[in-house]
Structure formats: structure tokens, C-alpha cells
């Protein structure tokens, strides 16, 4: 089966790489615009230059193109804890990231939030914090992992999943309660 091509891809595939087919005259192949520029006017004829203009401030194109407008620069989302790693240029979008000792959690493909890396108090670092993943902690005996923090087994209720990890402690608490000692 031949993959379905959109109209623009079909038109582009007729021309050699780095060129696109003129929208009004499919016998003409125009040179694409360089990154950092956009298409102002199609080339008037074969072998003639495409009229490309540089993107204005606040916009960019990151690859060769025949776009009628540059793309708007992304803004880093302060409310998500994001900081600007590098600012937008005519040929590169803004790069957003997190501060030191934080990691990115992606809520969706294009939305991330910065959170502090876990310190593994009452445990040990199994895997260090990375750009897109929190520290992985292993808890000491008498502690269990809840929301990536090591919590005392005294906070483990029978209904929770921690019961397997905290079973000896829970039995001890139960035994002490049942013994009736003062």
C-alpha cells in the first residue's frame, strides 16, 4: 500500500529536494526559503529567485520552508515553574526548562511542569534525578514509598498497599494493642 500523501506533500514530491511546486503553475519548481525566513512571493519563473523575507521579532522558522508566515515564538510558562534556557531567534524557538534540582513532568506532549527532585530522606537514592524523571528512592526498613517520599510505617493503614512492606510493624502494633499491657 502506498501511504496517503497530503496535497502539499504530493506537490513537493514532484520537485527536487529543496524546491516546491509553484501553487499557480505546476510546471515551475521554486527554491524553498532558508530557516529564519518565510515565503513573501513565489518565484516568477523557472530559475528565478523566490522572494523570502526574514522573520520579524517574536517569530521564527526552524527549517527550510514555503510558509506564508513565520511561527510565533513559544513563551515559557512561569505558572508551571518553567524558566527560559535560550531565547527565541529567527531560526530557533524559545527553549524552556527547569531550574537546578528539578525535573520535568509532561502532562501532555507539549505541556510540562517543573517539580523538585526527591531527596530520599529516610531512604537511599536508587536512580538519580534526571531531566525528565524524578529521583527513584529505596526506603529504609520501617518506611514505605508514598508519592515518592519515604513515610514511616506508623502511617500505614491496613487498607493501603504499604501493608506488605510494613507487615512486621503492623503486626507488632496490633500485638501491642491486643496484649492489654500497661
Amino acid at each position: 500500500l502506498v501511504p496517503h500523501l497530503g496535497d502539499r506533500e504530493k506537490r513537493d514530491s514532484v520537485c527536487p529536494q529543496g524546491k516546491y511546486i509553484h501553487p499557480q503553475n505546476n510546471s515551475i519548481c521554486c527554491t524553498k526559503c532558508h530557516k529564519g525566513t518565510y515565503l513573501y512571493n513565489d518565484c516568477p519563473g523557472p530559475g528565478q529567485d523566490t522572494d523570502c523575507r526574514e522573520c520579524e521579532s517574536g517569530s521564527f522558522t526552524a527549517s527550510e520552508n514555503h510558509l506564508r508566515h513565520c511561527l510565533s515564538c513559544s513563551k515559557c510558562r512561569k505558572e508551571m515553574g518553567q524558566v527560559e534556557i535560550s531565547s527565541c531567534t529567527v531560526d530557533r524557538d524559545t527553549v524552556c526548562g527547569c531550574r537546578k534540582n528539578q525535573y520535568r513532568h509532561y502532562w501532555s506532549e507539549n505541556l510540562f511542569q517543573c517539580f523538585n527532585c526527591s531527596l530520599c530522606l529516610n531512604g537511599t537514592v536508587h536512580l538519580s534525578c534526571q531531566e525528565k524523571q524524578n529521583t527513584v528512592c529505596t526506603c529504609h526498613a520501617g518506611f514505605f514509598l508514598r508519592e515518592n517520599e519515604c513515610v514511616s510505617c506508623s502511617n500505614c493503614k491496613k487498607s493501603l498497599e504499604c501493608t506488605k512492606l510494613c507487615l512486621p510493624q503492623i503486626e507488632n502494633v496490633k500485638g501491642t494493642e491486643d496484649s492489654g499491657t500497661t
Epitope: E79, H105, W107, F115, N134, E147, N148
Partner: nanobody, 119 residues
Framework: EVQLLESGGGLIQPGGSLRLSCAAS????????MVWVRQAPGKGLEWVSH????????YYADSVEGRFTISRDNSKNTLYLQMNSLRAEDTAVYYC????????????RGQGTLVTVSS
């Protein structure tokens, strides 16, 4: 105690509109970024939209961009989601929540309101 109470859900035909509300109490509403998330039957939570404390530069998921509008009234401690041009794939339980702070889970979110888009 933080309380978030959603309302406004219901059965609606494709192409129709609904406005969801979320009444907030137990915290300083005007100091918090607020979020709408949804859960379609048999699926995980999907981030729909969020709005910062002053209501500037709201975020929308690609799936709802241009159709949904998030807003807030800090004087009424209420968050809204105006949903237009509804589609069958918008069918879900919609929850309002406070933006998480400690980690990627929702410490505070409401009980949800069901939106069913069907003819």
C-alpha cells in the same frame, strides 16, 4: 478544608455548548492557578486547560483549542469552562483542580461533573 464543587454537566448533542462551573472554598482562590482535567470512560486523566492567578495566557490542550474557553471570577471564587462545538470524544467526567505543587498528582480536585455528547 479545600473544597471544589463542579456543576453544569449533562447530556448534549454534538455541536452544542455547555458551561461548567467550579465553586471553590477553603483556600485563597485568587492565589492559585486552576486546572480543568477530564477522564473519558476507560481512559486516564487528560489535562484540558489551566489559567493562572490573574487569568492571563490560558493554556488549552490541542484537542480543545478554539472550542473551549477557561475563565475565572476571583470575586466569586469560581472557575468556568465554556465548551462550544462539542464532539462525541469530549464525553468525560470533568474535574476542576488546584495546580499540583509537590509532585505530579492532584492533592485537591473536585468530585467531577459528567458531560455526555451524544445524538
Amino acid at each position: 478544608e479545600v473544597q471544589l464543587l463542579e456543576s453544569g454537566g449533562g447530556l448534549i448533542q454534538p455541536g452544542g455548548s455547555l458551561r461548567l462551573s467550579c465553586a471553590a472554598s477553603g483556600f485563597t482562590f485568587a492565589h492559585e492557578t486552576m486546572v480543568w482535567v477530564r477522564q473519558a470512560p476507560g481512559k486516564g486523566l487528560e489535562w484540558v486547560s489551566h489559567i493562572d492567578r490573574v487569568g492571563q495566557d490560558p493554556y488549552y490542550a490541542d484537542s480543545v483549542e478554539g472550542r473551549f474557553t477557561i475563565s475565572r471570577d476571583n470575586s466569586k471564587n469560581t472557575l468556568y469552562l465554556q465548551m462550544n462545538s462539542l464532539r462525541a470524544e469530549d464525553t468525560a467526567v470533568y474535574y476542576c483542580a488546584l495546580l499540583p505543587k509537590r509532585g505530579p498528582w492532584f492533592d485537591y480536585r473536585g468530585q467531577g461533573t459528567l458531560v455526555t455528547v451524544s445524538s
